[in-house]
């Protein structure tokens, strides 16, 4: 049983090898099987891995860039997750999230189809505020610290990729 599980894991790791030649793995429990991995130099939080892409690209190119690495633009599900993410961000930069409003009717959608929950959003005050600005970024405002803002999707920004940990 343990052998077949290991074989499965190895074949899964091979899929990642093209873009992630090196993995950082940690033991999650006492059992030898309880380890999880993130590509090096991605950071890990709970069951996910995160990568800050510092190249300035449009939202579409940023999402493409993440998907090529087996990830998506980041979907933020909790305040704790956002608090972890911002530790690795620069205050003078903005970063695309995996959040957009395709119809321009303020029906926001996450790239992975996670339901948009109004109660777990971190918009800056007064945001979102423009119907033709249909992509979301996270940035720092001295008055409110880190929060979200709507911007034009074609404006190049840095971005954050997120993927499930490799078990």
């Amino acid at each position: 049983f343990m052998y077949s599980k290991t074989v499965k894991r190895l074949s899964k790791l091979r899929e990642y090898q093209q873009y992630h030649p090196s993995l950082t793995c940690v033991m999650e429990g006492k059992d030898i099987e309880d380890w999880s991995c993130c590509p090096t130099p991605w950071t890990s939080f709970q069951s996910s891995c995160y990568f800050i892409s510092t190249g300035m690209q449009s939202w579409t190119k940023s999402q493409k860039n993440c998907s090529v690495m087996g990830a998506d633009l980041v979907v933020i599900n909790t305040r704790e997750e956002q608090d972890f993410i911002i530790q690795n961000l620069k205050r003078n930069s903005s970063y695309f999230l995996g959040l957009s409003d395709p119809g321009g009717r303020r029906h926001w959608q996450w790239v992975d189809q996670t339901p948009y929950n109004e109660n777990v959003t971190f918009w800056h005050s007064g945001e979102p505020n423009n119907l033709d600005e249909r992509c979301a970024i996270i940035n720092f405002r001295s008055s409110e610290e880190w929060g979200w803002n709507d911007i034009h999707c074609h404006v190049p920004q840095k971005s954050i990729c997120k993927m499930k940990k490799i078990y």
């Epitope: 505020n129 074609h154 404006v155």
Partner: antibody, heavy 123, light 111 residues
Amino acid sequence: EVQLVESGGGLVKPGGSLRLSCAASGFTFSSYTMSWVRQAPGKGLEWVAYISSGGGNTYYPDSVKGRFTISRDNAKNSLYLQMNSLRAEDTAVYYCARHDYYDGGLYYAMDYWGQGTLVTVSS
Amino acid sequence: DIVMTQSPDSLAVSLGERATINCKSSQSVDYDGDSSMNWYQQKPGQPPKLLIYAASTLESGVPSRFSGSGSGTDFTLTISSLQAEDVATYYCQQTNEDPPTFGGGTKVEIK
């Protein structure tokens, strides 16, 4: 009927300033991102600036950044371009254009253009 | 910046004949099967007029003899049967990523 009418062009010396205006009518001006695009005599089209519908966000190419400022007054249905430190290479017809978004707002086209106003920078 | 290269620079076509203009972008302007490619027509002394957006969607009121095709980095504007009123300069444009950039233009004349 959508109409965009530019004004304010003219002859100005190098280093001088000029303020262009674009009066919009026939649509809800405050709902649209707007651009300025220029065309040097006998040349192609070059984007100069755009401003979001609410006026909070503005963008420029490197060629004009720090010298040109785009602004708008939604109450007056007007778009402006303040041009400072003008150079001979800024000589062009300046058009204002409306953005129309498609494919879920990822992209846009400039669906309406004004007739343009000529700016000549020469000593 | 994304560079848009149009060819040819000019084109002379007989009335009723087909005119084809090409536009190549320095990098892909697609996402999820959609393209951020637009085509404009500019007649002498007039502002540009939007003909086609999203690579192949005809703007309202534009005659059906105009069509657009292509994806990725290679796009084409076709006038199936050239009319006298089609004499103009045609420009491609991408709006995938700022700054929005235009091709150098293709001048279409009657042979």
